[in-house]
Interface confidence: low
């Protein structure tokens, strides 16, 4: 019940691919560090051919000192990577207790109570996804595939789609065959989901001196896990902004964690030999080597940790949830051994939490994070992670308390600020959220350069009438989160024509437009009949898009699926539409009636994807008072006429008439999407 779409997460660090080889690797890090020239001509390896990472340098090698220049470079790279990604987490869901109950854990099944769209985390579902799609960012750090993507959609709230109920798994670029593909149930709310930062998940680890496990001296460790960064177009590597500052560099370069206890130092040669196999990607051999060490030295924390890492690598290689569950268990075993070095304990539990999140076991992950915070009470980064853990299960109250605690101790913690601001905004404390979001983003701290924060800061400013909103959208655009200041959708295919308003001729869908305009009265009458006889079919917009007023929708198609129940209410309209696959097959859109009553204002908002265009057919339009702005042009509806706009651009609606306004919304695929893309892009 708890699978991960591995697809989503393999070999996709395009955002940091500085040398053009199709993935992020040590060479890219060197380029970003200025240790190597950026390649301009090497063609990117098609993702299908890219080697899956085997977590180079995951954690720190057993050897304590860098042996040569290469090692020193790697150490610098770790620092850089640390800047790039603040060890973060994923989404999903779990109930497994730490020392869990002995009954049948709900854990994995738990997510089966959720409707979110991720497909088995390791086992992928859609084998033909378009490779150029990018998500402009609702991804942040680390790991998951899961609903990461979805989140944005809701977060960005599929604006005009109050009832959009299925999330999306975006751009799966690598596709691996799997035996058991099971659909993972997930939900589709607007939500937190730590960005899928795809990639290198660098973990801040505090390494207390061995004799005093409480004081934490910061250490960084790189945990590499590969996720799709959706090749965002021109995303400036997050690092370049920060590492030029010598102070920053100093701050990041930290001592290596101590991973060996006294006993493990006596078997260091054996540990090194096994670790070398793992580093070289000989995972099966490494697994056997570490298993043998665990058998020989059952009390060795480092051997047990090596076994966990190998299982973790093997899970990634085989795209197996089952193997990953074993790794999660082994990371837990490390923590239960006697005399575990504090650094190793922290690394092991952090990775356990991370992998639990990857599998969607949010609850189990939360318990692991709670334990980490108890063990290392002075480590702010762990508290920040714990806050995210609470957010991921929807427990805003506890998350808020955690961030309040962090900010009371470290008032300038940018990570805590953006998340605290995020929570305030979710609680509709719009004005209060602004300074936290703003100062948090301005801090430049790891984990703060996330499209969601720019999105919500701009949105909050717009809602309080602060014109500075567009400055933040501009910055979000510059940093690669939005396609432009106006076009702020996050599920995007690169290179599609982008303009707010379209003519029927430009879309190529002239037959559909003619059919809608010829049959507008039939469509109108069926909509009015539903309003009269089955008003309950019109569902209110529930995504906090309205400043005020009353706005409901009655959906006939959603995600390319016909709603049979709804079509009973508008049978002729449904029959009419069946002839037009550009709309009925548009899995990133809906077909629906939209009724808006007088006194309604819909805040400026943005749709989730640039893959669709939205047609509005006027059905009942009051003489004056109704208007729609898309980008910087405002239009009005006419009865029997179609307006076409790209709702990935900011749009806003006013209804100040004296009677209701009824329109018919028909989403169509963006005309430049190929048939193959239309087939393979995941639904929204």
């Amino acid at each position: 019940f708890d699978l991960v779409d591995y697809e989503e997460v393999l070999g996709k660090l395009g955002i940091y691919d500085a040398d053009g080889d199709g993935d992020f690797d040590v060479d890219d890090a060197k380029v970003l560090l200025g240790l190597k020239e950026r390649s301009t001509s090497e063609p990117a390896v098609p993702p299908e051919e890219a080697e899956p990472h085997t977590e180079p340098e995951e954690q720190v090698p057993v050897e304590a000192e860098p042996q040569n220049i290469e090692d020193e470079a790697k150490e610098q790279i770790q620092s850089l990577l640390h800047e790039m990604v603040h060890a973060e987490h994923v989404e999903g869901e779990d109930l497994q207790q730490e020392d869990g109950p002995t009954g049948e854990p709900q854990q994995e099944d738990d997510e089966f109570l959720m409707a979110t769209d991720v497909d088995d985390r390791f086992e992928t579902l859609e084998p033909e996804v378009s490779h150029e799609e990018t998500e402009h960012s609702y991804h942040v750090e680390e790991t998951v595939s899961q609903d990461c993507n979805q989140d944005m959609e809701e977060m960005m709230s599929e604006q005009e789609n109050p009832d959009s109920s299925e999330p999306v798994v975006e751009d799966e670029r690598l596709h691996h065959d799997t035996d058991d593909v099971t659909y993972q149930v997930y939900e589709e709310q607007a939500v937190y989901e730590p960005l899928e930062n795809e990639g290198i998940e660098i973990t801040e680890v505090t390494a207390p001196p061995e004799d005093n496990p409480v004081e934490d001296s910061q250490v960084i460790v790189e945990e590499v896990s590969i996720f799709p960064v959706e090749e965002q177009q021109e995303v400036p590597p997050e690092t370049n902004r920060k590492t030029d500052d010598p102070e920053q560099k100093a701050k990041v370069k930290k001592k290596k964690p101590k991973l060996l206890n006294k006993f493990d130092k006596t078997i260091k040669a054996e540990l090194d030999a096994a670790e070398k196999l793992r580093k070289r990607g000989k995972i099966e051999e490494a697994v056997n080597a570490f298993k043998e060490l665990v058998r020989k030295y059952p009390q060795s924390p480092r051997a047990r940790y090596g076994k966990a890492q190998c299982e973790d690598d093997l899970a990634e290689k085989r795209r197996s949830n089952e193997v990953l569950r074993g790794a999660i268990e082994t990371y837990q075993e490390v923590a239960s051994l006697p005399d575990v070095p504090a650094d190793l304990l922290k690394l092991s539990l952090k990775r356990r939490s991370d992998r639990q999140q990857f599998l969607g076991h949010m609850r189990g992950s939360l318990l692991t994070l709670q334990r980490l915070v108890q063990l290392f009470p002075n480590d702010t980064s762990l508290k920040n992670d714990l806050g995210v853990g609470y957010l991921l299960i929807g427990d805003n109250d506890n998350a808020k308390k955690v961030y309040e605690e962090v900010l009371s101790v470290t008032p300038n913690d940018g990570f805590a600020k953006v998340h605290y601001g995020f929570i305030l905004k979710a609680q509709n404390k719009i004005a209060e959220s602004i300074p936290y979001l703003k100062e948090g983003i301005e801090s430049g701290d790891p984990g703060t350069d996330d499209g969601r924060f720019y999105f919500h800061l701009g949105d909050a400013m717009q809602r309080v009438g602060n014109k500075e909103a567009y400055k933040w959208y501009e910055l979000g655009h510059k940093r690669g989160h939005f396609a432009s200041v106006w076009q702020r959708s996050l599920y995007n295919v690169n290179g599609l024509k982008a303009q707010p308003w379209w003519t029927p001729k430009e879309t190529g869908y002239t037959e559909l437009v003619k059919s809608l305009e010829r049959n507008w009265k039939l469509i109108r009458d069926e909509g009015l009949a539903v309003m009269d006889k089955a008003k309950g079919l019109f569902l209110p917009e529930d995504e906090n898009l309205r400043e005020k007023g009353d706005w409901s929708q009655f959906t006939l198609w959603q995600q390319g699926r016909r709603n049979e129940n709804a079509c009973k209410g508008a049978p002729k309209t449904c029959t009419l539409l069946e002839k037009f696959p550009e709309t009925t097959g548009c899995r990133r859109g809906q077909i629906k009636y939209s009724i808006m009553h007088p006194g309604t204002h819909v805040w400026p908002h943005t749709g989730p994807t640039n893959c669709r265009l939205r047609m509005h057919l006027g059905l009942v339009i009051p003489k004056e008072g109704c208007k729609i702005r898309c980008a910087n042009e405002t239009k009005t509806w006419e009865e029997g006429k179609v307006l076409i706009f790209d709702d990935s651009f900011e749009h806003e609606v006013w209804q100040d008439a004296s009677s209701f306004r009824l329109i018919f919304i028909v989403d169509v695929w963006h005309p430049e999407l190929t048939p193959q893309q239309r087939r393979s892009l995941p639904a929204i």
């Epitope: 207790q97 869990g100 002995t102 709310q189 309950g536």
Partner: antibody, heavy 127, light 107 residues
Framework: QVQLVESEGGVVQPGRPLRLSCAAS????????MHWVRQAPGKGLEWVAV????????RYAGSVKGRFTISRDNSKNTLYLQMNSLRPEDTGVYYC????????????????????WGQGTTVTVSS | GIVLTQSPATLSLPPRERVTLSCGTS??????LAWYQQKPGRAPRVLTY???NKAAGTPARFSGSGSETDFTPAISSLEPEDFAVYYC????????AFSPGTKVDIK
């Protein structure tokens, strides 16, 4: 408004089957997992079964496993409970209940409380 | 499966009194515990989920606390409409289970 309405239950002889249905309206039925819960006369609540939002997985209480089947038809916004080999101890009021979902912006996560319940339908198993 | 216990089975109290209920679980359920209220002849309704999070429409006088195996919801001041049966429910492990219930009636 959000509503769940169970079909008429009825009196049925031991060993015979009965199918209950639960019609949902006023919300996006296909986005919610759904439960059946029952209550024997004068007794407490007993969880019976749950089904995922898309019908792809289900779970049952030990007392009904192998005899009851939960299913759903999202195109009809309807939840079903097929009860076979009924026993006198299956007598009671049967409720369908929706799994509530988060409305915050941070987590695509369903809360697992049963946030909307039907009015209940009585099933009597007696010879 | 996990067994839930509740005590007492019946509680007789006057209006405006503070009431504390208790629910115990045979194993650690972390915070995966919800409280429901049921009035005679009516369907139950959720009051709190995940121990302390109030469901929509739950009055402020209701609160929940506890973790792992011991949980204590409270009503700060009983109103006439609060006289009902209260159940706790765990969703940590399958099968999900309800407690036997505590009936709160008017003294």
């Amino acid at each position: 408004q959000v509503q769940l309405v169970e079909s008429e239950g009825g009196v049925v002889q031991p060993g015979r089957p009965l199918r209950l249905s639960c019609a949902a309206s006023g919300f996006a039925f296909s986005s919610h997992a759904m439960h059946w819960v029952r209550q024997a006369p004068g007794k407490g609540l007993e969880w019976v079964a749950v089904i995922s939002h898309d019908g792809s997985r289900d779970r049952y209480a030990g007392s009904v496993k192998g005899r009851f089947t939960i299913s759903r038809d999202n195109s009809k916004n309807t939840l079903y409970l097929q009860m076979n080999s009924l026993r006198p101890e299956d007598t009671g009021v049967y409720y369908c209940a929706r799994v509530g979902r988060s409305s915050n912006w941070f987590s695509r996560y369903y809360y697992y409380d049963m946030d909307v319940w039907g009015q209940g339908t009585t099933v009597t198993v007696s010879s | 499966g996990i067994v839930l216990t509740q005590s007492p089975a019946t509680l007789s109290l006057p209006p405006r009194e503070r009431v504390t209920l208790s629910c115990g679980t045979s194993q650690n359920v972390s915070h995966h515990l919800a409280w429901y209220q049921q009035k005679p002849g009516r369907a139950p309704r959720v009051l709190t989920y995940d121990v302390a999070n109030k469901a929509a429409g739950t009055p402020a006088r209701f609160s929940g606390s506890g973790s792992e195996t011991d949980f204590t919801p409270a009503i700060s001041s009983l109103e006439p409409e609060d006289f009902a049966v209260y159940y706790c429910q765990q969703r940590s492990n399958w099968p999900q289970a309800f407690s036997p219930g505590t009936k709160v009636d008017i003294k």
